[in-house]
Structures are given as structure tokens and as C-alpha cells.
């Protein structure tokens, strides 16, 4: 008889729980040891890395990964074709764009090939695991004597992303931040011409196309003020 242990894996939806199936035995054996949890992230919907902590195994083990999509046309079990390694031991699997179907339930199964009954299955909603590339091409426009507008680009559909802008002056100890919706535009209404400003932006796949919690990396910073604004008072887009 199989026993199923449910433990949350951090993916919000209840259908995305982590199912660990083990076979009970008379004495404690390798088959009762839990397998490491698999963490998947979809990078800009270009590729996906599903990784696990290979060092959590009591002895070096080349765990294998299979995946499929639940209740869909893509429900055929697939073997990982591109493993990631850590110290010559499998520690992840990379899937390419054509293998990523965001809005179908992704099922990933980790298995110990030496103990086939020792396996763990997780169900993930990939639209909640997308991490976009960092924003690019930050530009600043001076709309008036005291107003600046920051624009940027993303290598993704604008309406799928929300953004976080941070800015500070050389006199500030901490960043001021402002959320920005899919329109990827930010205005600072009151700029002190005597100060040097630094801006940076990051983006997240939320809330219109998914419910991802993870932000992109920060963009390269862009600077404005005192020693730079004299060079071109209306446009400055040099990345540091």
C-alpha cells in the first residue's frame, strides 16, 4: 500500500502541492528517505530550470527526472534530455521553450534509479514560476524643470509584467520605491537639480498573466543630475 505525504512547496495553488510517495518497509531503508524537493523557474518563457539539492542525498546519487502535463494533449511522460550537474551528480534539468506550456499543470517526478519505488511527484503551475529578464534600455526624459520621466523596455509582453522602480540621491541612505503597472513608465514630479539621482527597475510576471512571486534581477542603474544633466538636459540614458 502506498502512503502519500503532503507538504507545501511554496507554490500558492493547492493543486501545486508536493506529493511524496514512498513504499513502507519492515526496516528503515533507502526507500523511506525523502527525495529532495524540485524547484522550477521559467526564465522569460525561453527555458526552464528544475533543480534539486543533490547534496541532501546520503551518498552521491544521479537522480532522474521525468515530466508531463496533466489532463492535456501533452500528457505523455517525457524523460529529461538535458541534465544539470553539480560535482558530476545530477542536480537539475533544463527544458527548452517548446517543452514549456504555461497554463497546463506541470507534473515533475524525481526518482532514484537504484530504488525505483523511491520517487516524489510535484504538480506546478508554471505561470506562477516565470522570472522575466531584467528591464533594459532605461531612459530619462526631462518633462519640465522639475519633472523627470523614466522609461524602459522588457523582452516580454508588456501587459504580463508589473514593475518596481527604486530611486535615490547621493544624499539618501535608502531607496525610495514605487510600483508601476504594465505601462512601464514612471514619473518623478519633483527633482532637485543640485542632487544626483540613481534609478533602477525590476519586473515580475504578475498579475495579468500569472501570479509569480519572484522578481527579475535589477536593471543596470541609470543616473541623472548635477554632473550629468548639464551634458544633455533633455535626455540621458547612459547605463552605469
Amino acid at each position: 500500500l502506498n502512503t502519500t505525504i503532503l507538504t507545501p512547496n511554496g507554490n500558492e495553488d493547492t493543486t501545486a502541492d508536493f506529493f511524496l510517495t514512498t513504499m513502507p518497509t519492515d526496516s528503515l531503508s533507502v526507500s523511506t528517505l525523502p527525495l529532495p524537493e524540485v524547484q522550477c523557474f521559467v526564465f522569460n518563457v525561453e527555458y526552464m530550470n528544475c533543480t534539486w539539492n543533490s547534496s541532501s542525498e546520503p551518498q552521491p546519487t544521479n537522480l532522474t527526472l521525468h515530466y508531463w502535463y496533466k489532463n492535456s494533449d501533452n500528457d505523455k511522460v517525457q524523460k529529461c534530455s538535458h541534465y544539470l550537474f553539480s560535482e558530476e551528480i545530477t542536480s537539475g534539468c533544463q527544458l527548452q521553450k517548446k517543452e514549456i506550456h504555461l497554463y497546463q499543470t506541470f507534473v515533475v517526478q524525481l526518482q532514484d534509479p537504484r530504488e525505483p519505488r523511491r520517487q516524489a511527484t510535484q504538480m506546478l503551475k508554471l505561470q506562477n514560476l516565470v522570472i522575466p529578464w531584467a528591464p533594459e534600455n532605461l531612459t530619462l526624459h526631462k518633462l519640465s524643470e522639475s519633472q523627470l520621466e523614466l522609461n524602459w523596455n522588457n523582452r516580454f509582453l508588456n501587459h504580463c509584467l508589473e514593475h518596481l522602480v527604486q530611486y535615490r540621491t547621493d544624499w539618501d541612505h535608502s531607496w525610495t520605491e514605487q510600483s508601476v503597472d504594465y505601462r512601464h513608465k514612471f514619473s518623478l514630479p519633483s527633482v532637485d537639480g543640485q542632487k544626483r539621482y540613481t534609478f533602477r527597475v525590476r519586473s515580475r510576471f504578475n498579475p495579468l498573466c500569472g501570479s509569480a512571486q519572484h522578481w527579475s534581477e535589477w536593471s543596470h542603474p541609470i543616473h541623472w543630475g548635477s554632473n550629468t544633466s548639464k551634458e544633455n538636459p533633455f535626455l540621458f540614458a547612459l547605463e552605469a
Epitope: 518563457v45 505561470q127 501587459h159 495579468l208 500569472g210
Partner: antibody, heavy 119, light 107 residues
């Protein structure tokens, strides 16, 4: 089989509000957007807005932003479109249509609900 | 808002003809272009999504091409059931917008 079934025709007076429902079945409701598109008599298609059923986020065309509200009841897989301050030019067939977010088109449509605004 | 302009507005053709409808976007929409067919009194039906991908169940005589701002829907050999109104639709930028439609009539 995917089905979107809309509520019946409505006749309203100018200034009133109308609430049209769209009940979905045959697919995982929360993986989709639901769009609302209207078509005035003899005219083309006009996108009003959409709601992401996986989280409830909405977006509206500027023209409708102050008058339209999209809501969803995930327990019954039903989406609602409420349009307020009706005027005669709102007379149209209103469609709900689902699409997966990202780059997919609207692959299933409701049968349409005729809303007539007349004094 | 992105304007979608279809041409021609109406078109007469015969069964067996090859027909092309064009759609121009007022700014770059990459490949985020869909095509729909609508018959009188009916809801629209998706034909092509993401510029050239055929929706399931749509006959292979329908095809889409183009990129950026200029797109084309081609029907390689018109069938009697193809006489309808066709709309292009951009899914690149909110608000999503439709072309004004092309009415395809029997000659």
C-alpha cells in the same frame, strides 16, 4: 467540451446598469483570461476588457474604464460584466471569450447577449 | 491605442479562388496577431493565432503570415462556407484592438 454560456437578452433604460453573466465549463477555469467584446448592430468588434481568472486582475479599455466592472466567481466558474450609466450607443451584442494569456487568441466564445438601451 | 487597419473592407470572390486579406498595425506588434471569422448572427471563431499558428480544427487552406506591422490572411481555395466577415486582432498591447473587418462575398 469547452462551453461558455451567457445570460439572456436585456432591455434597459438610459442611465441604468446591466449585468451579464458568462458560465464556463469543460476546462480549468483559473488558467485563462475572460475577455468581453461587444458588437453594435452592423459594426465591428470592440474589446472592452478582460479578467485573469487565476488571480482576479482586470484591465479595461480606456473608453469603458469608468463604467465597466468585471468580476468572477471561481466557485461557479462564472464571470460577470457590469456596465453602468447606459446610453443608446451601448446597444450591442456582448460576448465573453476566453483565451490563455500570453500569445493565444480567443479560442472559445459565448453565444452573445443582446443588450438594448431604449427609453 | 494601436490602430488595426484591414484592407479591403469588402471583397467579392468565387469558390476555388485564392484570397488575401491584409491587416496593418499602427505600431510594431511582433507576431501577436490573430484572425477571426464571423458569420451573421454568430459569435466569431478563431482561425489563426500568433500570426501563423492554425487553431485546432481550422482547415489548412487558411494561413497567416507577416511580422511587425503588416500581416496577411490567405485562403488558398475558397469554399462555400468561407463567405463571412474576417477580423484581425492584436494581442500585443493593452487595450487589445480589432481591425474594422473584411466582408468576403460571393461574386
Amino acid at each position: 467540451e469547452v462551453q461558455l454560456v451567457q445570460s439572456g437578452a436585456e432591455v434597459k433604460k438610459p442611465g441604468a446598469s446591466v449585468k451579464v453573466s458568462c458560465k464556463a465549463s469543460g476546462y480549468t477555469f483559473t488558467s485563462y483570461w475572460m475577455h468581453w467584446v461587444r458588437q453594435a448592430p452592423g459594426q465591428g468588434l470592440e474589446w472592452m476588457g478582460h479578467i485573469y481568472l487565476g488571480g482576479g486582475a482586470t484591465n479595461y479599455a480606456e473608453k469603458f474604464r469608468s463604467r465597466v466592472t468585471l468580476t468572477a466567481d471561481t466557485s461557479t466558474s462564472t464571470v460577470y460584466m457590469e456596465l453602468s450609466s447606459l446610453r443608446s450607443e451601448d446597444t450591442a451584442v456582448y460576448y465573453c471569450a476566453r483565451s490563455q494569456p500570453y500569445y493565444y487568441g480567443m479560442d472559445s466564445w459565448g453565444q452573445g447577449t443582446t443588450v438594448t438601451v431604449s427609453s | 491605442d494601436i490602430q488595426m487597419t484591414q484592407s479591403p473592407s469588402s471583397l467579392s470572390a468565387s469558390v476555388g479562388d485564392r484570397v488575401t486579406i491584409t491587416c496593418r498595425a499602427s505600431q510594431d506588434i511582433s507576431n501577436y496577431l490573430n484572425w477571426y471569422q464571423q458569420k451573421p448572427g454568430k459569435a466569431p471563431k478563431l482561425l489563426i493565432y500568433y500570426k501563423s499558428r492554425l487553431h485546432s480544427g481550422v482547415p489548412s487552406r487558411f494561413s497567416g503570415s507577416g511580422s511587425g506591422t503588416d500581416f496577411t490572411l490567405t485562403i488558398s481555395s475558397l469554399q462555400p462556407e468561407d463567405f463571412a466577415t474576417y477580423y484581425c486582432h492584436q494581442g500585443h498591447t493593452i487595450p487589445f484592438t480589432f481591425g474594422q473587418g473584411t466582408k468576403l462575398e460571393i461574386k
